[in-house]
Amino acid sequence: QHHGVTKCNITCSKMTSKIPVALLIHYQQNQASCGKRAIILETRQHRLFCADPKEQWVKDAMQHLDRQAAALTRNGGTFEKQIGEVKPRTTPAAGGMDESVVLEPEATGESSSLEPTPSSQEAQRALGTSPELPTGVTGSSGTRLPPTPKAQDGGPVGTELFRVPPVSTAATWQSSAPHQPGPSLWAEAKTSEAPSTQDPSTQASTASSPAPEENAPSEGQRVWGQGQSPRPENSLEREEMGPVPAHTDAFQDWGPGSMAHVSVVPVSSEGTPSREPVASGSWTPKAEEPIHATMDPQRLGVLITPVPDAQAATRRQ
């Protein structure tokens, strides 16, 4: 078990096209050891995108997020500004990954889990799908995360999430703006750990959400430019290890796929996905109710299934 703090575990081959800052909640710089410098942007659906730090829109977005984070702290809100070893905030299963990003989780000896992150509005906004999570999951910024709808028609349903060792990234979350759940639209990458949730000031106004309904696959989604065409990857089978190509997803507008490849190491699970405590408490699902992430194949090229052992990774769909 090694703790490679300086090892490059997020590499970017392609950069995303523009994303409105209104759909972003965090950014992170990749490690110097990665060679090619990149900014990892997290959208409000907890997807990660590689962006070119030299582009003006990226600079503006970072500046905007910094200001939002500063305003939040001034107003007594909480936000994450982590330094040093940072655990990824979202799971591959919870959202697509930018194919230009490679996340390299390292075994650290701990058995904390990669968490399914509710891809709130933005996820849906982007593609209209998201993993289904229990209501009221508390995110790492101490705000309540609303339940999310099921996947769209045609997407793989009932896909359970599995536990993997935490990804230790030496990168720093430079800024963390208040979470604004909502759809979004580009190609991404993801990390583990509880996502920050919706704008605290909005909590009182959330609607009661009856049972999630199924959504139509391509609704709500538009094309921003030439981008790539969706390549559905319904097959979740993959070799036991190795980078997981996270597919350029239906965000055709976001330029040539900037979704991530994730190397994940399934560990034995005791049947119940564990949850790490978060800022305002922790949440543990009932053992008899595995978390189901239901997603649109277009949206998520990488779907990880919870498995009791490594071999089962290719069996359980």
Epitope: V21, A22, S120, Q124, G182, Q198, S209, A216, G220, R222
Partner: antibody, heavy 119, light 107 residues
């Protein structure tokens, strides 16, 4: 076809509350945002906030935080906007609009609900 | 907040004229701009989003261009049904803001 049908005109006294409804049809309600925008007489457009019916989470324009409640009922595909502590300057036409998932622009609009605040 | 300034606030034109409306943002909105048309007593109608993408069913005589803080809506050949008020809207950052509107009247 996509339609957003809003509730009828309202006349309210200052300090009261108003709740406007917006019934969606012709698309999957939970796949899009519902935004609320208002237009005072002879004036421009002002964004109030959005709600994502898929999970019920809202986002507000700071100017409206605190006295605006946005909700959505998935069973009836209806979104609601409630504005409290009404004042005369809240007299306006209130529109709901559908927002696609790739950006917060508004591709379909309700017909508008006139809210008059007068003592 | 990003302020959107539209000019002119009104203009008179004839059928067949080429009409140009400008929208200036107080900050860089990176092409995340939409244009709407509104007729009296009606709701606005989306014409263009992402600075130049035509919305469904919008005639090709409408076009958008621009970058940074300066954007333009052009109607290449004004038609009788185009007499209306036009608004721009930025969706780069919240709160989303609109221009004050440009009323296109018959000369």
């Amino acid at each position: 076809q996509v339609q957003l049908v809003q509730s009828g005109a309202e006349v309210k006294k200052p300090g009261a509350s108003v709740k406007v409804s917006c019934k969606a049809s012709g698309y999957t309600f939970t796949n899009y945002y519902i935004h609320w925008v208002r237009q005072a007489p002879g004036q421009g457009l002002e964004w109030i906030g959005w709600i994502y019916p898929g999970d019920g989470s809202p986002k507000f324009n700071e100017r409206f935080k605190g006295r605006t409640t946005l909700t959505a009922d998935k069973s009836t595909s209806t979104a609601y906007m409630e504005l409290s502590s009404l004042r005369s300057e809240d007299t306006a036409v209130y529109f709901c609009a559908r927002g696609p998932t790739d950006g917060d622009y508004f591709d379909y609009w309700g017909q508008g609900t006139t809210v008059t605040v007068s003592s | 907040d990003i302020q959107m300034t539209q000019s002119p606030s009104s203009l008179s034109a004839s059928v067949g004229d080429r009409v140009t409306i400008t929208c200036r943002a107080s900050g860089n909105i990176h092409n995340f701009l939409a244009w709407y048309q509104q007729k009296p007593g009606k709701a606005p109608k989306l014409l263009i989003y992402n600075e130049k993408t035509l919305a469904d069913g919008v005639p090709s005589r409408f076009s958008g261009s621009g970058s940074g803080t300066q954007y333009t809506l052009t109607i290449s050949s004004l038609q009788p049904e185009d007499f209306a008020t036009y608004f721009c809207q930025q969706f780069w950052s919240t709160p989303y803001t609109f221009g004050g509107g440009t009323k296109v009247e018959i000369k």
